[in-house]
């Protein structure tokens, strides 16, 4: 028979032969030959390969460096890499999560629209009319101005996006 020019799924062509790829979690030790099947070996501790492959070396699991604010979110297996995330109050600087930065705080006049996670930063929004924020915070939303009317009071000082209204007693002087 003619030597193959293409192989089936999960095979590779070498020396005019179709050899089986190694399954995820295993590395190639020896290509198949006329006399033998492909020889594969499991990846060692702290190593992985996540695809059908012909790699002669497994990849090292990612190290979640605490000095960079990282911690393990999901421990790696022989078939998957370790997934890192950031310590409380920090978030990843990239999708690969190789380092962390402190969550951003929303300045006075801005409130938290979306609280930060291990992988995304705080999202702030300006306080609209009727709302305010007088603190720099990574958690506080814009608060509504106090309703003087419901307290049977009147507005003595208008609110801003950074300050609440100031209520005062009704003026009792009648003409």
């Amino acid at each position: 028979p003619e030597p193959p020019t293409a192989c089936r799924e999960k095979q590779y062509l070498i020396n005019s032969q179709c050899c089986s790829l190694c399954q995820p979690g295993q590395k190639l030790v020896s290509d198949c030959t006329e006399f033998t099947e492909t020889e594969c070996l499991p990846c060692g501790e702290s190593e992985f390969l996540d695809t059908w492959n012909r790699e002669t070396h497994c990849h090292q699991h990612k190290y979640c460096d605490p000095n960079l604010g990282l911690r393990v979110q999901q421990k790696g297996t022989s078939e998957t890499d370790t997934i890192c995330t950031c310590e409380e109050g920090w978030h990843c600087t990239s999708e690969a999560c190789e380092s962390c930065v402190l969550h951003r705080s929303c300045s006075p006049g801005f409130g938290v629209k979306q609280i930060a996670t291990g992988v995304s930063d705080t999202i702030c929004e300006p306080c609209p009319v009727g709302f305010f924020s007088n603190v720099s915070s990574a958690f506080e939303k814009c608060h509504p101005w106090t309703s003087c009317e419901t307290k049977d009071l009147v507005v003595q000082q208008a609110g801003t996006n950074k300050t609440d209204v100031v209520c005062g007693p009704q003026d009792r002087l009648r003409a």
Epitope: P1, V29, S30, F35, T36, E37
Partner: antibody, heavy 115, light 112 residues
Framework: QVQLQQPGAELVKPGASVKLSCKAS????????IYWVKQRPGQCLEWIGG????????NFNEKFKSKATLTVDKSSSTAYMQLSSLTSEDSAVYYC????????WGQGTTLTVSS | DVVMTQTPLSLPVSLGDQASISCRSS???????????LHWYLQKPGQSPNHLIY???NRFSGVPDRFSGSGSGTDFTLKISRVEAEDLGVYFC?????????FGCGTKLEIK
């Protein structure tokens, strides 16, 4: 071209050890196992075992596990088989062989165990 | 261990004749990957073995097409369609499906 070079003959006394060599050339040494085969006159060939030069991993015929030790020297592209506690039963022709993209045999080393 | 039994032990032929050698294994040589690792080779006096056929029916490069292999499971045959003088020697079958690899004890092809 692929070549496996073996010394022609070795004469050794009973009880001693001998280290047979197989020098490979013409290909990337670490890419293929080297296997060893024993042939005694009038008897069937016997497969002794093989070694992967990439990592030194071996597979053996259980019958030869305590008789043969397989090693490689990557720097000189040479495979070795050490045979220990030799007796007349070990007198034979020993071939090294490699397969993958063709099959190649050394010329064989004739081992004579005699006092 | 898998026992490989070759018949006949000696096969006298006339040049130009067809020759047929049988090899039987004590268990199936079908590997879990679908391949059958049964091989044939020829050894001439004072020489190393020379492989002819691998995996039942695949000829090695340079092997004339008068050599053909067939069979499956435990029963295998090597045929030489028209024997030439250079074909004389001892033919062996071997299996590499199961460890330890094992060999037949040979069939001597000689002139009648």
């Amino acid at each position: 071209q692929v070549q496996l070079q073996q010394p022609g003959a070795e004469l050794v006394k009973p009880g001693a050890s001998v280290k047979l060599s197989c020098k490979a050339s013409g290909y990337t040494f670490i890419s293929y196992y080297i296997y060893w085969v024993k042939q005694r006159p009038g008897q069937c060939l016997e497969w002794i075992g093989g070694i992967n030069p990439r990592n030194g991993g071996t597979n053996f015929n259980e019958k030869f596990k305590s008789k043969a030790t397989l090693t490689v020297d990557k720097s000189s592209s040479t495979a070795y088989m050490q045979l220990s506690s030799l007796t007349s039963e070990d007198s034979a022709v020993y071939y090294c062989t490699r397969h993958g993209n063709g099959v190649y045999w050394g010329q064989g080393t004739t081992l004579t165990v005699s006092s | 261990d898998v026992v490989m039994t070759q018949t006949p032990l000696s096969l006298p032929v006339s040049l130009g004749d067809q020759a047929s050698i049988s090899c039987r294994s004590s268990q199936s040589l079908l590997h879990s990957n679908g391949n059958t690792y049964l091989h044939w080779y020829l050894q001439k006096p004072g020489q190393s073995p020379n492989h002819l056929i691998y995996q039942v029916s695949n000829r090695f490069s340079g092997v004339p097409d008068r050599f053909s292999g067939s069979g499956s499971g435990t029963d295998f045959t090597l045929k030489i369609s028209r024997v030439e003088a250079e074909d004389l020697g001892v033919y062996f079958c071997s299996q590499t499906t199961h460890v330890p690899w094992t060999f037949g004890c040979g069939t001597k092809l000689e002139i009648k």
